[in-house]
């Protein structure tokens, strides 16, 4: 769930995912349009569509609880737990270091970036 | 080999509290990924999971249920234990243990032990 | 929770014919997994991920399915098939199994 991932991002990248990435260019935040504005933003929209394909798999990616361990700057998803949980943790893990391996271009520009401003194409998934 | 082995009261009150004791052996609940659960079946019906118990005691219950289950663990003694507070007829079932591995489901299950609840 | 539904609840077959057995569930799981259970014992595990046979298992036998629709199927009904099968799914929590089905030797 939400929970997971704040908790899970902040452990990663050392920021604050509500004051640092959610919201963060056109698509780190709740839902998510046109172009990727920078490297974090693409983590971003990569993870929504991670998610997407959870949802298509029935699964309750708001609500879903999963365990974890962090020890050593590393996620270990833990194979407890229901498949969606699983998979949910996997997507989580994978945004969180895609954040902490783009920490050298994030702009603080791009916190808060007003939506209308995001044009063209949506990446696909 | 892997084998359990379940144990409980036989009969009870309604109200009362039930213990079941799952003994193992074949396998370790200190090893990574390894879990128990309890399972029951009312006789001529179907199977209904009730709690699960991992290796370093994170513990799943049915959300049915949970206000009313104890699931425990003695990994020295390979025992694991279910307790159902205030129980009433609707609680005559076979209990099983079964362990689960690292997969979605149950490789091994214990024979079952028949619980009645007299009203 | 995910409610599994099997179809049908009750069936007989002859020795040799071809049987399939059905688990419908109320959204769309990863994988699907069945145990067969005869009167007096506890639940043998039968097929697992879906489509993989448990050890000990005949080849006769065969999963399939995807999304919210898999199946069970005996290529020849022999005697010792008789049993109830059950399928059982972990894609989210809680975990949940189907209410079975009881297959008869007609």
């Known amino acids: 769930g939400i929970l997971n991932l704040n908790k899970m991002v902040k452990q990663v990248t050392g920021k604050m995912p509500i004051l640092s990435y959610w919201p963060y260019g056109c698509h780190c935040g709740l839902g998510g349009r046109g172009q990727p504005k920078d490297a974090t933003d693409w983590c971003c929209q990569t993870h929504d569509c991670c998610y997407d394909h959870l949802k298509t798999q029935g699964c309750s990616i708001y609500k879903d609880y999963y365990r974890y361990n962090f020890s050593q700057g590393n996620i270990h998803c833990s194979d407890k737990g229901s498949w969606c949980e699983q998979q949910l943790c996997a997507c989580d893990k994978e945004v969180a270091f895609c954040l902490k391996r783009n920490l050298d271009t994030y702009q603080k520009r791009l916190r808060f970036y007003w939506r209308p401003h995001c044009r063209g194409q949506t990446p696909g998934c | 080999q892997v084998t359990l082995k379940e144990s409980g009261p036989g009969i009870l009150q309604s109200s009362q509290t039930l213990s079941l004791t799952c003994s193992f052996s074949?396998?370790?609940?200190?090893?990574?990924?390894?879990?128990v659960s309890w399972i029951r079946q009312p006789s001529g019906k179907g199977l209904e999971w009730l709690a699960h118990?991992?290796?370093?005691?994170?513990?799943r219950y049915n959300p049915s249920l949970k206000s009313r289950l104890t699931i425990s663990k003695d990994t020295s003694r390979n025992q694991v234990f279910l307790k159902i507070t205030s129980v009433d007829t609707a609680d005559t079932a076979t209990y099983y243990c079964?362990?689960?591995?690292?997969?979605?489901?149950?490789?091994?299950w214990g024979q079952g032990t028949l619980v009645t609840v007299s009203a | 929770q995910i409610v599994l539904t099997q179809s049908p609840a009750i069936m007989s077959a002859s020795p040799g014919e071809k049987v399939t057995i059905s688990c419908s569930a109320s959204?769309?799981?990863?994988?699907m997994y069945w145990y067969q259970q005869k009167p007096g014992s506890s639940p043998k595990p039968w097929i697992y991920?879906?489509?993989n046979l448990a050890s000990g298992v005949p080849a006769r036998f065969s999963g399939s399915g995807s999304g919210t629709s898999y199946s069970l199927t005996i290529s020849s009904m022999e005697a010792e098939d008789a049993a109830t099968y059950y399928c059982?799914?972990?894609?989210?929590?809680?975990?949940?199994f189907g209410a079975g089905t009881k297959l008869e030797l007609k």
């Open positions: 079964a362990r689960k591995h690292s997969d979605y489901w149950f490789a091994y």
């Open positions: 074949g396998f370790s609940l200190s090893t990574s990924g390894m879990g």
């Open positions: 118990i991992y290796w370093d005691d994170d513990k």
């Open positions: 959204s769309s799981v990863s994988y």
């Open positions: 991920r879906t489509s």
């Open positions: 059982q799914q972990y894609h989210s929590s809680p975990l949940t």
